[in-house]
């Protein structure tokens, strides 16, 4: 009896795992084996597919074959007993195009009101994603084990922290990877559950802010209790995308280790130009808080967003304010090549009633003033970037007297 060729061959590629599945064409024939050949683009000869020779089942794995994942290949299969069937050719395919992203590995760390999620690709040093490893983004679904109400979080990186959770509560989540550059969405990880801890008697520090004084950064935060010590750590922000990088490590700011005040001062040269994350932890000697929420710290914006310098031209019923670049020490103007908004506050010298103007322009008119009256003006700059929402401190107040009447022209 002639053997029929196997049919309906499916190629499943997940990360670096290449799996073939097919249907027997004749279930009644026993002791049949199956073998595959493959052919690369531009080749005439067929080569035996290692791992897929004389297979008794209807599934085989050819992951050991070192293929160029961007190169098209063709497969063929036949059945074998005493004789062989004709070859059945599978449509040619490019492994990279066909590949799915496998489930990522997930490690969870519990706090009382937060969970830290560490995500890494499921296949370490994957050949399939070798050129795209740093382009992975992840999305997750999280739910309270007791309620099952799901919340989705999109576009996160290899380390993500979810805040505002309840203590002593079990949360479950699953994560999948995506390669947006290739329009690929991966397979969900298994569900991971973790219980948040009992509430920490010491809350994490809050409202962390960085400002500049002279050649130093001043880092300030709020804390509920007195007689505490604090430590501050920093991390290059870009490393959040790549914890596999050996540089991924939170490091101490030496001048902010075991400080007993809710601020610390350290030289600007501690940080080179760049974007950093900062976090603070409190301790009372026996117990330690969890880490604070991380703040983003851009040396360009946060350090050098100095208060604006301005000149006032006084008229009888208005001021014309001309805003210039702030001066560094040495009287050189600071080049600020990101868009700013200016907040101008003015008041009558004899009154506490302040009025405010917000302007993008660097020449601003303050209208509706009374003649021969002393008004004071102060100004500050804000970045227009929502992600790096930063404000300078206010400039020193400058007070000027308006001119007598009829000088408004």
């Amino acid at each position: 009896k002639n053997l029929k060729s196997p049919q309906k061959v499916e190629v499943d590629i997940i990360d670096d795992n290449f799996i073939l599945r097919w249907n027997r064409s004749d279930e009644s024939v026993g002791n049949v084996t199956f073998s595959f050949d493959y052919q690369k683009t531009g080749m005439d000869n067929w080569i035996k597919l290692s791992g897929c020779q004389n297979i008794t089942s209807t599934k085989c794995n050819f992951s050991s074959l070192k293929l160029n994942v961007y190169e098209e290949i063709k497969l063929r299969i036949r059945a074998e007993k005493e004789n062989t069937s004709s070859w059945y050719e599978v449509d040619s395919f490019t492994p990279f195009r066909k590949a799915q992203i496998g489930p990522p590995e997930v490690h969870l760390e519990a706090e009382d009101k937060a969970i830290v999620i560490h995500i890494s690709p499921g296949t370490k040093d994957s050949v399939m994603w070798a050129l795209d490893g740093l382009s992975f983004t992840y999305s997750l679904v999280i739910w309270k084990n007791s309620s099952g109400v799901e919340e989705r979080i999109e576009n996160i990186y290899s380390r993500h922290k979810i805040y505002k959770l309840s203590p002593e509560t079990t949360y479950c989540l699953k994560v999948k990877a995506a390669l947006l550059t290739s329009w690929k969405i991966g397979v969900y990880s298994p569900v991971h559950c973790i219980k948040t801890t009992v509430e920490n008697e010491l809350p994490p520090p809050e409202n962390i802010e960085v400002s500049v004084q002279n050649q130093n950064y001043v880092l300030k935060w709020d804390y509920t209790y007195a007689n505490m010590t604090f430590q501050v750590q920093w991390l290059h922000a870009f490393l959040k995308r790549n914890p596999g990088n050996h540089l991924y490590k939170w490091k101490q700011i030496p001048d902010c280790e075991n400080v007993k005040t809710t601020q610390c001062v350290f030289p600007q040269n501690v940080f080179q130009k760049g974007i950093y994350l900062l976090r603070v932890q409190a301790s009372d000697g026996n117990n330690t808080s969890f880490w604070s929420e991380e703040i983003k710290f851009d040396t360009e914006i946060q350090a050098f967003l100095l208060p604006p310098v301005f000149n006032i031209r006084s008229l009888s019923d208005s001021f014309h304010i001309y805003i210039g670049a702030p001066k560094q020490s040495g009287n050189t103007p600071v080049i600020q090549d990101y868009p700013l908004i200016y907040e101008i506050i003015f008041w009558e010298n004899t009154s506490n009633a302040e009025r405010k103007i917000i302007e993008k322009k660097t020449d601003v008119t303050v209208p509706n003033l009374k003649p021969l009256t002393v008004y004071c003006v102060k100004a500050r700059a804000h970045t227009m970037d929502e992600k790096l929402n930063k404000s300078s401190v206010f400039s020193d107040a400058v007070c000027e007297k308006t001119k007598p009447g009829n000088t408004s022209k």
């Epitope: 490690h107 760390e109 519990a110 706090e111 009382d112 830290v116 560490h118 380390r159 973790i194 219980k195 801890t197 009992v198 920490n200 008697e201 914890p243 050996h246 991924y248 490590k249 939170w250 026996n286 117990n287 330690t288 969890f290 880490w291």
Partner: antibody
Framework: QVQLVQSGAEVKKPGASVKVSCKAS????????MNWVRQAPGQGLEWMGK????????HFNQKFRDRVTLTVDKSTSTVYMELSSLRSEDTAVYYC????????????????WGQGTLVTVSS | DIQMTQSPSSLSASVGDRVTITCKSS??????LAWYQQKPGKAPKLLIY???SLETGVPSRFSGSGSGKDYTLTISSLQPEDFATYYC?????????FGQGTKLEIK
């Protein structure tokens, strides 16, 4: 598979120093803390300190701070623990043990252990 | 330093028994607790981390529970190979500290 292989047993005189090695394989050496734990005969376990193999940052149990030195040789994925000014009560089995990932926010458990090195201090 | 107190310090049981060992910390350790098994002349072996998570390859008869300052290791049905000494360890604050151990013997 992850393996931590320690150097052989040592006999030392009081006042001397001992240096125990721990060679790691089967994982990315610079991604995990390496800890040292000792166990005196018939006694419990005592944590001595840990080192980050990527940059040699160390943390010590205050009890050993003045006498213990932890070092790394990245080229051979080996960590060393040197204990100085030995006394008879330092007779113990010394273990290296892999700790949590350095990139994690908090410390982790000790998931892989070396086979132990017996250090005997006797005059 | 955080003190870890294990109880009992020794325990006799038979194959098939359900066994519970407890560990109390002097401060809250926020589930940063591990359980280890040690057999004579061997290195300790990690069983449980994070108070409740079973280490890969460890039989499911071992389980961990607890929170705050009070933690428990349970062996649901003792097997002959389970007779050993068990240690708890906190890794919340440095120095990391261990309990004094619980020796589990055959009755």
């Amino acid at each position: 598979q992850v393996q931590l292989v320690q150097s052989g047993a040592e006999v030392k005189k009081p006042g001397a120093s001992v240096k125990v090695s721990c060679k790691a394989s089967g994982y990315t050496f610079t991604s995990y803390w390496m800890n040292w734990v000792r166990q005196a005969p018939g006694q419990g376990l005592e944590w001595m300190g840990k080192i980050d193999p990527s940059d040699s940052e160390t943390h010590f149990n205050q009890k050993f701070r003045d006498r213990v030195t932890l070092t790394v040789d990245k080229s051979t994925s080996t960590v060393y623990m040197e204990l100085s000014s030995l006394r008879s009560e330092d007779t113990a089995v010394y273990y290296c043990a892999r700790g949590g990932r350095i990139s994690f926010d908090y410390d982790g458990a000790l998931d892989y252990w070396g086979q132990g090195t017996l250090v005997t201090v006797s005059s | 330093d955080i003190q870890m107190t294990q109880s009992p310090s020794s325990l006799s049981a038979s194959v098939g028994d359900r066994v519970t060992i407890t560990c109390k910390s002097s401060e809250v350790i926020y589930n940063r607790l591990a359980w280890y098994q040690q057999k004579p002349g061997k290195a300790p072996k990690l069983l449980i981390y994070g108070a409740t998570s079973l280490e890969t390859g460890v039989p499911s008869r071992f389980s961990g529970s607890g929170s705050g300052k009070d933690y428990t290791l349970t062996i649901s049905s003792l097997q002959p190979e389970d007779f050993a000494t068990y240690y708890c360890q906190q890794y919340w604050n440095k120095p990391f500290t261990f309990g004094q151990g619980t020796k589990l013997e055959i009755k």
